[in-house]
């Protein structure tokens, strides 16, 4: 259904091979990426509320597909926020976490409970924040607590964890 307005290969925005996206735009794509669909000549990337397409052979397209395949994009994306480094102390983090397999959590109550009760946390180096993750499944239930999304999805356990307890009083968490 390439070119179809309603199909998985409809494009909201086409990016020409001659003018690849900027670094800033790529970071935005990484953060909001939910899924991709391989079409005949191009790949369609589904974002939070819009879509963007690029040629199958374009390096940035290959990079984004690989990023989602490895779950380093989308809801899993942390991002490096340089201007927020002052929020965290300079003491080294204590490594204590493992990701949780929370993909089987579906109801809002369960998701909230899981996030609030979770004790398994990823170890993030100083200067990183783990909140404000994007969702990966369009049909997944979402609830918001203190302005942050709590979502279920592949490796959601990794992404909804709070920063370390010893990360400092000003470090934001994904559930308050």
């Amino acid at each position: 259904n390439e070119g179809s307005v309603t199909g998985s290969c409809y494009c909201g925005k086409r990016i020409s091979s001659d003018s690849p996206p900027s670094v800033q735009f790529m970071n935005r794509l990484r953060k909001h990426l939910r899924a991709y669909h391989r079409c005949l000549y191009y790949t369609r990337f589904q974002l939070l509320s819009w879509s963007v397409c690029g040629g199958n052979k374009d390096p940035w397209v290959q990079e984004l597909m690989s990023c989602l395949d490895l779950k380093e994009c989308g809801h899993a994306y942390s991002g490096i926020v340089a201007h927020q480094k002052h929020l965290l102390p300079t003491s080294p983090p204590i490594s204590q976490a493992s990701e949780g397999a929370s993909s089987d959590i579906h109801t809002p109550a369960q998701m909230l409970l899981s996030t609030l009760q979770s004790t398994q946390r990823p170890t993030l180096p100083v200067g990183s924040l783990s909140s404000d993750k994007e969702l990966t499944r369009p049909n997944e239930t979402t609830i918001h607590t203190a302005g942050h999304s709590l979502a279920a999805g592949p490796e959601a356990g990794e992404n909804q964890k709070q920063p370390e307890k010893n990360a400092g009083p000003t470090a934001r968490t994904s559930a308050t």
């Epitope: 990484r30 991709y36 690989s66 490096i80 397999a101 993909s103 990823p122 990966t136 592949p154």
Partner: antibody, heavy 118, light 113 residues
Framework: AVQLVESGGGLVQPKESLKISCAAS????????MNWVRQAPGKGLEWVAR??????????FYADSVKGRFTFSRDDSKSMVYLQMDNLKTEDTAMYYC?????????WGQGTLVTVSS | DIVMTQSPSSLAVSAGETVTINCKSS????????????LAWYQQKPGQSPKLLIY???TRQSGVPDRFIGSGSGTDFTLTISSVQAEDLAIYYC?????????FGGGTKLELK
């Protein structure tokens, strides 16, 4: 060709420390999610640790059995990963494999043997 | 954690036979983001590291003979080895990489009848 070469294994006593390394080549290292997997003699495979890529702040994750004792780090400029193992226990005795998860598959090294014995 | 249940634990075969190894996961390994199944199959011979045969449940690693076929989706997966040869005698493991911690099946030992 893709290569992962582990080094640094050896015989240590319980409660001692050891740092093992893995040198990678033949693929875009900075884009790979790196893991350590171990295999005790005559046993199955057990995941040990994972480190994410730079855009995700090199976040690390550990198996419950090693949490608080092992530290995983990477150096993208050298295409190297390291596993610092402290307070070693006899049950940590195993062949330790470095693995690289890429979209083209999961690559494994030949392993380095860590023996913890008094 | 996702539990991987592999069967049978051992299998005695004759050269030329076709064998099937099953792997079942406690939850779906199909990721909606890319419609890929996060399952791999490995072959391990004594004294060697595991060798990747299949990834994304059905994609054969380069250099792996086409007699190795991976199939299945969701929670049920199969490794089929057609016309088994002597060099195929080894332990075979399935592994999920859908979620951390990665988990492995208990292994299937392929022996000569």
């Amino acid at each position: 060709a893709v290569q992962l070469v582990e080094s640094g294994g050896g015989l240590v006593q319980p409660k001692e420390s050891l740092k093992i390394s893995c040198a990678a080549s033949g693929f875009t290292f900075s884009n790979a999610v790196m893991n350590w997997v171990r295999q005790a003699p005559g046993k199955g495979l057990e995941w040990v640790a994972r480190i994410r890529t730079k855009p995700n702040n090199y976040a690390t994750f550990y198996a419950d059995s090693v949490k608080g004792r092992f530290t995983f780090s990477r150096d993208d400029s050298k295409s190297m990963v390291y596993l610092q193992m402290d307070n070693l226990k006899t049950e940590d005795t195993a062949m330790y494999y470095c693995t690289a998860w890429t979209t083209e598959g999961i690559y494994w090294g030949q392993g380095t043997l860590v023996t913890v014995s008094s | 954690d996702i539990v991987m249940t592999q069967s049978p634990s051992s299998l005695a075969v004759s050269a030329g036979e076709t064998v099937t190894i099953n792997c079942k996961s406690s939850q779906s390994l199909l990721y909606s983001g890319n419609q890929k199944n996060y399952l791999a199959w490995y072959q391990q011979k004594p004294g060697q590291s595991p060798k990747l045969l299949i990834y994304w449940a059905s994609t054969r690693q380069s250099g792996v003979p086409d007699r190795f076929i991976g199939s299945g989706s969701g929670t049920d997966f199969t490794l089929t080895i057609s016309s088994v040869q002597a060099e195929d005698l080894a332990i075979y493991y399935c592994q999920q990489y859908y979620d951390t911690p990665w988990t492995f099946g208990g292994g299937t030992k392929l022996e000569l009848k």
